[in-house]
C-alpha cells in the first residue's frame, strides 16, 4: 500500500524536501519546557533522520531531539529564551538544512478546558467561562482569546469572538431559540511571545431556551 | 487497539461535493503523517493525499489535484477530505490511515462514495 497511484506522484512544489516547523511550549510540564518540530512533506522519508538544536542553551551546546512516532521532541529546562537557536536536520554529523529560531517566537499555549455556559434567566444572557493553564505561569501569561460558537446544524458558520479574558457574555437575543450550541475556543499569545493557536479546547454544548420560557441555568447536554 | 473510522460518503451527482470525516483513537495522532486512500471494484488501494503531522504540509494525487483538499484536528483525532467537483472516476470504497504503514495496521470499514447522475 505504499506509494501513490500510478497517476503520478505527489509533486506539490511549494514543498522542500527537508523543510519542517516547530513550535515551543514554555512550562508546559513544572519548569521545563518543550520543542516539537515536524517535516512540512508527508513524503519525506524520515527513518535516518534527526534534530538538533544548538546555541541559545543554558549550560550545553547542543540537544539532540527524541523521535516521536513522525515528530521530533525535547523537554528541558536549558533553553535560555534569549536570542536565536539553530535547529538543524541531520543525517549522520551532516545537516541537511537548518533555520535560526527565537523560540520566544514559536509558541503554542496549551488548550483551554473547563469550558462551561450558565444561562442567566434574569439577565437574559449566556455567561460562557474557561480556564486556562498559563494564569500560574511565569512566562506566558497574557493570551488572547478566541471563542467560537455555531448553532449545531450549521456546519461551517462559526461566530468568533477575540477577548483577553476567561469570561464572555453572550446576550440571548443574538442566538436563535430553542436551538443546540456548540461552543470552543483556543488562545495565542499576545505580549512579548509570539506564536500559534493553541488546539481548540473540548466543545461545550448547550440549548437555548425557548421564547418566553423559564428554564434557569443551562445544562450541558 | 488502533480504531479508525470513517464517514461522510454518499451518492452524489458529478460536479457535487462531499466531505469525508475520519476519527481515529488507539494511538497518538498528533505524531502521524496521515493519508486518504481510495479502492475502486476491481483495483488497488491508492493513495490520495497525505498531511503533514502538524497539517502545514499536503501531498495530493495527479488525479485529485486542485478539487480535493486534506486536513486534520490533532485537538480531536480527526482527519478530514474535502472532495469538490467529483467525477465518475472518483466512485470508490475512501479510506483513512497512516502514511508509513506497519505491518500490524488494520484498516477502517471505509466509507463509499458514488459518483453518479
Known amino acids: 500500500e505504499s506509494g501513490y497511484a500510478q497517476n503520478g506522484d505527489l509533486e506539490d512544489a511549494e514543498l522542500d524536501d527537508y523543510s519542517f516547523s516547530c513550535y515551543s511550549q514554555l512550562e508546559v510540564n513544572g519548569s521545563q519546557h518543550s520543542l516539537t518540530c515536524a517535516f512540512e512533506d508527508p513524503d519525506v522519508n524520515i527513518t535516518n533522520l534527526e534534530f538538533e538544536i544548538c546555541g541559545a542553551l543554558v549550560e550545553v551546546k547542543c540537544l539532540n531531539f527524541r523521535k516521536l512516532q513522525e515528530i521530533y521532541f525535547i523537554e528541558t529546562k536549558k533553553f535560555l529564551l534569549i536570542g536565536k537557536s539553530n535547529i538543524c536536520v541531520k543525517v549522520g554529523e551532516k545537516s541537511l538544512t537548518c533555520k535560526k529560531i527565537d523560540l520566544t517566537t514559536i509558541v503554542k499555549p496549551e488548550a483551554p478546558f473547563d469550558l462551561s455556559v450558565v444561562y442567566r434567566e434574569g439577565a437574559n444572557d449566556f455567561v460562557v467561562t474557561f480556564n486556562t493553564s498559563h494564569l500560574q505561569k511565569k512566562y506566558v501569561k497574557v493570551l488572547m482569546h478566541d471563542v467560537a460558537y455555531r448553532q449545531e446544524k450549521d456546519e461551517n458558520k462559526w461566530t468568533h469572538v477575540n477577548l483577553s479574558s476567561t469570561k464572555l457574555t453572550l446576550l440571548q437575543r443574538k442566538l436563535q431559540p430553542a436551538a443546540m450550541y456548540e461552543i470552543k475556543v483556543r488562545s495565542i499569545p499576545d505580549h512579548y511571545f509570539k506564536g500559534f493557536w493553541s488546539e481548540w479546547s473540548p466543545s461545550y454544548y448547550f440549548r437555548t431556551p425557548e421564547i418566553n420560557n423559564s428554564s434557569g441555568e443551562m445544562d450541558p447536554i | 487497539q488502533v480504531q479508525l473510522v470513517e464517514s461522510g460518503g454518499g451518492l452524489v451527482q458529478p460536479g457535487g461535493s462531499l466531505r469525508l470525516s475520519c476519527a481515529a483513537s488507539g494511538f497518538t495522532f498528533s505524531q502521524r503523517i496521515m493519508s486518504w486512500y481510495r479502492q475502486a471494484p476491481g483495483k488497488e488501494r491508492e493513495l490520495v493525499a497525505s498531511?503533514?503531522?502538524?497539517?502545514?504540509?499536503?501531498r495530493y494525487a495527479d488525479s485529485v489535484k486542485g478539487r480535493f483538499t486534506i486536513s486534520r484536528d490533532n485537538a480531536r483525532n480527526q482527519l478530514y477530505l474535502q472532495m469538490n467537483t467529483l467525477k465518475p472516476e472518483d466512485t470508490a470504497v475512501y479510506y483513512c490511515n497512516k502514511r508509513n504503514l506497519e505491518i500490524s495496521d488494520d484498516w477502517g470499514q471505509g466509507t463509499q462514495v458514488t459518483v453518479s447522475s
Open positions: 498531511i503533514s503531522p502538524f497539517g502545514d504540509g499536503t
